[in-house]
């Protein structure tokens, strides 16, 4: 089970997808910044159907979506965005 604030000295994503997922089908998004043993940024998406997918951070759609979500105040996000806590 993936944990929102889990930290490890390795990458979490084995495979990444760039296939678009509409916001309405996303439950939450976790952003894992580069570092802590993983050389790349990772984005993990929890979907409404309970499945989980790693999304390519370079995918245009996720970049646009993250920008839209950043513009909204955290209290009104329909899709919570979590970032890994770096100790």
């Amino acid at each position: 089970v993936l944990e929102v604030y889990y930290t490890s000295l390795r990458c979490r994503c084995v495979q990444e997808s760039s296939v678009f997922i509409p916001r309405r089908f996303i439950d939450r998004i976790q952003i894992l910044p580069r570092g802590n043993g993983c050389p790349r940024k990772e984005i993990i998406v929890w979907k409404k159907n309970k499945s989980i997918v790693c999304v390519d951070p370079q995918a245009e759609w996720i970049q646009r979506m993250m920008e839209v979500l950043r513009k909204r105040s955290s209290s009104t996000l329909p899709v919570p965005v979590f970032k890994r806590k770096i100790p």
Epitope: I21, P22, R24, W61
Partner: antibody, heavy 121, light 106 residues
Framework: EVQLVESGGGLVQPGGSLRLSCAAS????????MAWVRQAPGKGLEWVAS????????YYRDSVKGRFTISRDNAKNSLYLQMNSLRAEDTAVYYC??????????????WGQGTLVTVSS | DIQMTQSPSSLSASVGDRVTITCKAS??????LTWYQQKPGKAPKRLIY???ILQTGIPSRFSGSGSGTEYTLTISSLQPEDFATYFC????????FGQGTKLEIK
């Protein structure tokens, strides 16, 4: 011109099964999420299920989970809804709808004319 | 799940009247709202998406507004062809339709 044509509706007994089909034309079918929406006689609209581009991702309303299966065949430009363990409350006109997306937002821009499913003994 | 409460459920009006229909969401839907018109025996027709963007080919007498949890559809001057049932749809989290507003001739 975008066209969606549903078929497969009919009268079925409670507990029975039915498979609805939706034939799509006038657009690149594989480029769109698709959905089924239903409307009980004289009632409002109710989203039933959605499917992503290649059929690998599906979503259902709680009341049909485990009973209904949405699928698609991109080679045939067709969308399907397999309905099992049907109940009286599933009686409705079932619409096939195209889900149009821009930045993950606006949706359901094109609809078929619907097919009537009646569950009764 | 997000609930949508649409009001009124029915409305009598005359040609030329200004009419407003409201949809209230149980939580913030961030303007991710669509309005549909439906006539008996027909499929729903999209009028407005993203709260206030008019669908191509829809007359400018239709307009939408709102934010947060409250949204409105306004018909500035009713025409005979506007008598129908109107539904709102939130697409912020899965989908939920409003119960519908039947617009009848007074």
């Amino acid at each position: 011109e975008v066209q969606l044509v549903e078929s497969g509706g009919g009268l079925v007994q409670p507990g029975g099964s039915l498979r609805l089909s939706c034939a799509a034309s006038g657009f690149t079918f594989s480029d769109y999420y698709m959905a089924w929406v239903r409307q009980a006689p004289g009632k409002g609209l109710e989203w039933v299920a959605s499917i992503n581009y290649d059929g690998g991702d599906t979503y259902y309303r709680d009341s049909v989970k485990g009973r209904f299966t949405i699928s698609r065949d991109n080679a045939k430009n067709s969308l399907y809804l397999q309905m099992n363990s049907l109940r009286a409350e599933d009686t409705a006109v079932y619409y096939c709808a195209r889900e149009e997306d821009y930045d993950g937002s606006y949706v359901m821009d094109a609809w078929g004319q619907g097919t009537l499913v009646t569950v009764s003994s | 799940d997000i609930q949508m409460t649409q009001s009124p459920s029915s409305l009598s009006a005359s040609v030329g009247d200004r009419v407003t229909i409201t949809c209230k969401a149980s939580q913030n839907i961030n303007k991710e709202l669509t309005w549909y018109q439906q006539k008996p025996g027909k499929a729903p027709k999209r009028l407005i998406y993203n709260t206030n963007i008019l669908q191509t080919g829809i007359p400018s007498r239709f307009s939408g507004s709102g934010s947060g949890t409250e949204y409105t559809l306004t018909i500035s001057s009713l025409q005979p062809e506007d008598f129908a049932t109107y539904f709102c749809l939130q697409q912020s989290s899965l989908y939920t339709f409003g119960q519908g507003t039947k617009l009848e001739i007074k």
